[in-house]
């Protein structure tokens, strides 16, 4: 008889989830020499251990600690790029600017990017039918807790000048409820981080406003300054050429680094 399974509001675990995580791990460790020592089977076991046979609305950051330990990775100072509500552009940026890292350019972020997963209490099965939705079901679900955990760690280990890419087309350019606003901002370490520089990406072709004067950016500046970290903000006008360079990084004018 088919066992009764709780119906959640979110989509179920991504198909072929174990194989995907393992394959991504192997690929990442092959491409990044500094992570060659990582045993991908152990990584998968630690990942699995964080959520398998656990009630998917009761996951804690503690559950992910073995995985975090195995995936420890050092991002060089001045090379951390945070983002909020502008993921694709941030990732396109680091695809060209190879020496800079978003969370998803690190091993743990790369493993989980765009994936969904959850298990169920008291069974070793993965739930491919449905998983808890952050809003409709619970916030302490496997995916949300994972990103909160690794985002916290990513921010804690950042050093030097940290950059953040923000979406100037959003009504809240800085959103206190985003992962950046609720986790990363509060876990930058003042003794290691000299400054946070925000890049506000303009969407409109003729939007000449100074979006660094936006009230939400002023709020970000206030939070950062109170933590004794210097804050800078730049309007990124005319991003079209930047986007062209993303498509054609061999263009001679795209090769000059930051």
């Amino acid at each position: 008889l088919p066992r009764w399974r709780q119906q959640w509001s979110g989509s179920g675990t991504t198909s072929r989830f174990p194989e995907t995580v393992l394959a991504r791990c192997v690929k990442y460790t092959e491409v990044h020499p500094e992570m060659r020592h990582v045993d991908c089977q152990s990584v998968w076991d630690a990942f699995k251990g964080a959520f398998i046979s656990k009630y998917p609305c009761n996951i804690t950051e503690e559950d992910y600690q073995p995985l975090v330990k195995l995936g420890t990775q050092t991002v060089p100072c001045n090379k951390t790029l945070l983002w909020s509500r502008i993921k694709d552009l941030a990732h396109q940026f680091t695809q060209v600017q190879r020496d800079m890292f978003t969370l998803e350019d690190t091993l743990l972020g790369y493993l989980a990017d765009d994936l969904t997963w959850c298990g169920e209490f008291n069974t070793f099965e993965i739930n491919y039918q449905s998983c808890p939705d952050w809003r409709k079901d619970c916030s302490n679900n496997p995916v949300s807790v994972f990103w909160k955990t690794v985002s916290r760690r990513f921010a804690e280990t950042a050093c030097g000048v940290v950059h953040v890419m923000l979406n100037g087309s959003r009504s809240k350019i800085f959103d206190k409820n985003s992962t950046f606003g609720s986790v990363e901002v509060h876990n930058l370490q003042p003794e290691k981080v000299q400054a946070l520089e925000a890049w506000v990406i303009h969407g409109g072709r003729e939007d000449s406003r100074d979006l660094c004067q936006d009230p939400t950016i002023k709020e970000l500046e206030s939070i950062i300054s109170k933590r004794n970290i210097r804050f800078f903000c730049k309007n990124i006008y005319r991003p079209e050429k930047f986007l062209q360079c993303v498509k054609n990084p061999e263009d001679s004018s795209c090769l000059s680094g930051i």
Epitope: Q97, E206, C212, K234, R238, F242, S253
Partner: antibody
Amino acid sequence: QVQLVESGGGLVQPGGSLRLSCAASGFTFSSYGMHWVRQAPGKGLEWVSNIYSDGSNTFYADSVKGRFTISRDNSKNTLYLQMNSLRAEDTAVYYCARNMYRWPFHYFFDYWGQGTLVTVSS
Amino acid sequence: DIELTQPPSVSVAPGQTARISCSGDNIGNKYVSWYQQKPGQAPVVVIYGDNNRPSGIPERFSGSNSGNTATLTISGTQAEDEADYYCSSYDSSYFVFGGGTKLTVLG
């Protein structure tokens, strides 16, 4: 090597028209935005107008909006500035300049022509 | 629109440091470039993106930009640095230049 050569300047009466040209060579003209910048005798630089590499967007300083039109012919490697309803205060050396982009977010003028003098006087 | 204000003139002894300011409302939120113009010549970019030096520009030229002021610094100023200097910035629709500063190298 990159070369920008302006032509078409001269003496014109107030209210008159003039068309400036800028012949570009030594680079792929169709890949670069272009600008006109002017400098009145003994005065500072004033940005006039900008056109995207493919001609899709044009921008003007408030002082010339509605009177000047920037255009380009990528097949001829030439930039133009059509100047109508000219005034005495438009008297200046007019430079064309190449819009340089540097990864990730920087724009500036990296090559300039030697300029052509436009004198508006009765 | 952006408005950029520069001092009309700055004097410096050879070998000393010259600083040319460019002030504008929250100019630190935008990128600034600097141009050198010698008499009868077209301008030449010496700094772009606040503090980047194009190839061929001597290391003595540097830039900074925060708050309401961008600054061009010339360390160990030489006689050949005597020229007019213009700051410039841009937004989505406009480019703009400061009024220019005449740098005089004394002696």
